[in-house]
Amino acid sequence: DLKVEMMARGIQATRLNDSVTISCKVIYSQPLNITSMGITWFRKSLTLDKEVKVFEFFGDHQKAFRPGANVSLWRLKSGDASLKLPGVQLEEAGEYRCEVVVTPLKAQGTVQLKVVASPTSRLFQDQAVVKENEGKYMCESSRFYPKDINITWEKWTQKSPHHVVISENVITGPTIKNMDGTFNITSYLKLNSSQEDPGTVYRCVIRHESLHTPVSIDFILTAPQQSLSEPEKTD
């Protein structure tokens, strides 16, 4: 009896440009003789419903159809037919199929590969705003994937230790697609420093599926007209 076991829950995630090993375990009732077995890995893209060959191994030869794709001969001996892909790109997301042949038996399994990119975030003051006591603060997240992202603003004062979510005077711009398929977004907060207490801490919070925990960037409102102190990033 020949069986193939893929990643539990049938899904694997990796970061853009990282190396990923897509799991495929071969379960066979006898010791494996790699000279008489074959492994083929296929990918079906998310956009096209077409399968392409990524890597193949047959007893006396191996071939990578995607540069750098590899199955370890040394791991194969102990039943691990996992596929290593260095420098994964966004377009390589999709369904991967591991097909194992131990003549005359054949087994296969599939797994979804998800590729994510974490946002790079920064907070700065828009110098173009010249109205007295008014400041425009920008929280910019760039090069993230997939598109869905959540940016919120919070504040807390010395009087109240609780975070208050700010909903007024907040504008979050459209998501802009970069040439490489990643996305950028900017959220703006407008403040009238004359109406705010000096020492108030403002925070931009970024939530994205690539982040284990939300990323926060803080700034402290000082005296009017010199509103932005050194931002502090926490994650």
Epitope: S19, D60, L73, R75
Partner: antibody
């Protein structure tokens, strides 16, 4: 920085067992196999076997089959080598070594070695 | 098992002079165009350290005075100009077949 730190020296009686640990740090533990190699006093290197931390799969030198057990604890990035029914000719320095397995097969980082002395 | 035979078993070299070690395998260690032969140096009192893998690829951090060549059953490690820090025992190792085997070692000393 890649580091493999092995447990301390052991003195055992013939017939006993020994378990040597190898704590890995500075790399993704499951991306490489762990080789075990021994060296008897004044002698050359001898491959014992290797383990794939990804699935626990092992390959053993037939010479040691039935006496050696290789295991890993992924949660603490540690590999173990247990040798049973010890004999005096098992007296040696035992090394763990990180082994590349996708683009060739070679041991690029080694532990400091664990001296195992078998004596009655 | 694949048997690896190293020659010479010892050699004494003047600093600045070249050195060469041969490793012959009892059967080919090539697979699909690649040679699975590695070279290690074990300095006194230390674990072995990788010098060359896949017959001719220099491991990162290894001085370029070391080079490896060969395919099939015949392999050579060369040191273009021996330095005092090169003393120790040199081992070839094949990783094509299990058990992975080592040569018996070549001891290099400085004259």
């Amino acid at each position: 920085e890649v580091q493999l730190v092995q447990s301390g020296a052991e003195v055992k009686k013939p017939g006993a067992s020994v378990k040597v640990s190898c704590k890995a740090s500075g790399y993704t533990f499951t991306d490489y196999n762990m080789d075990w190699v021994r060296q008897a006093p004044g002698k050359g290197l001898e491959w014992i076997g290797d383990i794939n931390p990804n699935n626990g799969g092992t390959l053993y030198n037939q010479k040691f089959r039935g006496r050696v057990t290789l295991t890993v604890d992924k949660s603490i990035s540690t590999a173990y080598m247990e040798l049973s029914r010890l004999r005096s000719d098992d007296t040696a320095v035992y090394y763990c070594a990180r082994s590349e397995v996708f683009y060739g097969n070679y041991a690029d980082y080694w532990g400091q070695g664990t001296t195992v002395t078998v004596s009655s | 098992d694949i048997v690896l035979t190293q020659t010479p078993l010892s050699l004494s070299v003047t600093p600045g002079q070249p050195a060469s070690i041969s490793c012959k395998a009892s059967q080919s260690v090539d697979y699909d165009g690649d040679s699975y032969m590695n070279w290690y140096l074990q300095k006194p009192g230390q674990p072995p350290q990788l010098l060359i893998y896949a017959a001719s690829t220099l491991h990162s951090g290894v001085p370029d005075r070391f080079s490896g060549s060969g395919s099939g059953t015949d392999f050579t490690l060369k040191i273009s100009r021996v330095e005092a820090e090169d003393v120790g025992v040199y081992y070839c190792q094949q990783s094509k077949e299990d058990p992975r085997t080592f040569g018996q070692g070549t001891k290099l000393e400085i004259k």
